[in-house]
Structure formats: C-alpha cells, structure tokens
Interface confidence: low
C-alpha cells in the first residue's frame, strides 16, 4: 500500500517523447508501476515502466514513435496515469489531463562545434534536436561559458531571445581552456521549461602573438 503525497510531472519534447517523474512520500513495496498515456483523439496509447531514480521518485520515457515524428499537436490532450499493480488489478495512483504544448521541455541542443576561434573570441554553433516545426522561429536560448577556476553555477547566463543557433563569445583570455553549454526553450506553453544543458564543448583560445600588444 502507498500512503502520503504524490507528485506527477511530465514534459513533452515536442515530437515523440513524454518524460515523466512520479514522486511518492511513503513506502512503495516491490510494486510494478507504469505510466500510461491515453490520447483523446488518437488511436494509439503507450506505456512505460517507472524505474527508481531516488528513494521516493521514479521516472520513465513514453516513446510515442520515431524520434522526429510529430505524434501530438497543440489541440491534443493526453490522459496520463501512474498505475501500480495490486495482485491482478492496476490501481490508479496519480492522474493528469496533459496538454503537451503547455508542458514542453525540448531535448538538449546537439552538434556543438567551434566555427572560428581567435585569441579573444570564439564563434560556436549548435543544432536543435527533435524540435517541432510548429515552433517556426519561436525559440530562445541560454548559453554559459565555464572559465578556469570557476563552476558552472558561477557562469553568467547569456540570453538569445530568438532562434539563433550560434554565438560569438567575446573578451576571452588568450591561450585559455574554456567549456561552453547551451539550452533551448520554446516561447509557447504555460508550464514549459528549459531543456537540459547540452553536453559541454571544450575549446581553447589561440595564444597571443609574441611581441604584440594584446
């Protein structure tokens, strides 16, 4: 049996994945639990097995189809349930009517690369992954650069208020190792949140030329 409060949070990646986390205060004894997605206007439904991510929370990904297929639209509503098996029955532990385009979290940007690097600046580009064509250009980005001797949390955030898949980092120190990350967010959706940060891209600025004033 399960007692205590329950929190059930899901996000849609805008294409073919709904990721869910279920948190439950109280003991859950060796019970098989799943998330079940039941769209209001689609013929398919989908399930995923909740796997523990901490002592009181479980997560899973509902794979709705091929990664770049558009499985849901702005008018869809998907009933999402946490179901746990009790003997031969499934007990509903949590339920929500999920509006996918109000609860967006895109995949982290990919394919980060250094386009051009100099002593004091570096031009970096990236690509968005599995993002719906519905957004057109209505995306924004945040970027951060890790400098030597600092942490990611200390890095100032650079905001790009448009769909711009490149950045030119200025005022860098010559011959210095840096790391760079970027994340993306659609402008649409009341509960939409930032994507995870991209994998860090390591780069090194060029050394200053000898005998020249830098």
């Amino acid at each position: 049996a399960v007692n205590g409060t329950s929190q059930f949070t899901c996000f849609y990646n805008s294409r073919a994945n709904i990721s869910c986390v279920w948190s439950q205060d109280g003991a859950l004894q060796d019970t098989s639990c799943q998330v079940h997605a039941w769209p209001d206007r689609r013929r398919w439904n989908q399930t995923c097995e909740l796997l523990p991510v901490s002592q009181a929370s479980w997560a899973c990904n509902l794979i709705l189809g091929a990664p770049d297929s558009q499985k849901l639209t702005t008018v869809d509503i998907v009933t999402l349930r946490v179901l746990c098996r009790e003997g031969v029955r499934w007990r509903v532990m949590a339920i929500q009517d999920f509006k996918p385009f109000e609860n967006l979290r895109l995949m982290a940007p990919i394919s980060l690369q250094v386009v051009h690097v100099e002593t004091h600046r570096c031009n970096i580009s990236w690509e968005i992954s599995q993002a719906s064509h519905y957004f057109e250009r209505h995306l924004e980005f945040e970027a951060r650069t890790l400098s030597p001797g600092h942490t990611w949390e200390e890095a100032p955030l650079l905001t790009l208020k448009q769909k711009q898949e490149w950045i030119c980092l200025e005022t860098l120190t010559p011959d210095t190792q840096y790391e760079f990350q970027v994340r993306v967010k659609p402008l649409q959706g009341e509960f939409t949140t930032w994507s995870p940060w991209s994998q860090p891209l390591a780069f090194r600025t060029k050394p200053a030329a000898l005998g020249k004033d830098t």
Partner: nanobody, 123 residues
Framework: EVQLVESGGGLVQAGGSLRLSCVVS????????MAWFRQAPGKEREFVAA????????EYVDSVKGRFTVSRDNAKNTVYLQMNNLKPEDTAVYYC????????????????WGQGTQVTVSS
C-alpha cells in the same frame, strides 16, 4: 469464467434517452475495468466508454462526450451507460466488455463480452 448480460436497448426517437445495463457474474466484479462498445451494420466494433474498477475514472470516445455517461454499481455487479440526446448515427448493437488489465480495455482483443443489445435511433 465471467459472464456479461446486457439489457435496456430499444427503439427511440432522435433526441431521446436510453439507459443500458450490464450485469456481471462468475467472478469478482471489482477486478474488472468495464467498457461499452458498439457495432453498426457493416462497421467494425468501436470503443464507446469505459470505467475503471473503482468507478472514479471514466473514458469516452469523442463522439459521445457530453451525451453519454458510464457508471458502475459495485454492490450490484452492474455497469450502466446512460445515453442522452441520441442521434441516428448512434444506432448499433451495444456490447458490454470486461478486462482485468486496465491497459487493454479499449482493444477488442482479450475482453470478455456480452451478447449485445440493439439500440435503434429513428429520425
């Protein structure tokens, strides 16, 4: 093995109402998620509505939302389908279905079925 017996069908004019009942015997009723399906002449059997074992959660096909209400009385081993504002396109044989697996209830496979009751809506 579980047995299902439907009743309450009949002939009704468009805009009228009917209440279908399905009595379940042969097993513990609360083990089952219950559903109603329908099959019009020359068409495939289609999902209409479902109610979970507890009765707290219901599902409907879009075409009947706001007009049909599915419910159950676990003390009487009975599931109901209240059909209001009936339309000629609601004409079909209505079947009661039971499944212990919540996930499978919308599917026509692996359900236990009743024999069906005819609903005819005249214009």
């Amino acid at each position: 093995e579980v047995q299902l017996v439907e009743s309450g069908g009949g002939l009704v004019q468009a805009g009228g109402s009917l209440r279908l009942s399905c009595v379940v015997s042969g097993d513990v009723f609360v083990r089952y998620t219950m559903a109603w399906f329908r099959q019009a002449p020359g068409k495939e059997r289609e999902f209409v509505a479902a109610v979970t074992d507890s009765g707290r959660t219901t599902e409907y096909v879009d075409s009947v939302k706001g007009r049909f209400t599915v419910s159950r009385d676990n003390a009487k081993n009975t599931v109901y389908l209240q059909m209001n504002n009936l339309k000629p396109e609601d004409t079909a044989v209505y079947y009661c279905a039971a499944n212990t697996d919540y996930f499978q209830i919308r599917s026509v496979d692996n359900n236990a079925w009743g024999q069906g009751t005819q609903v005819t809506v005249s214009s």
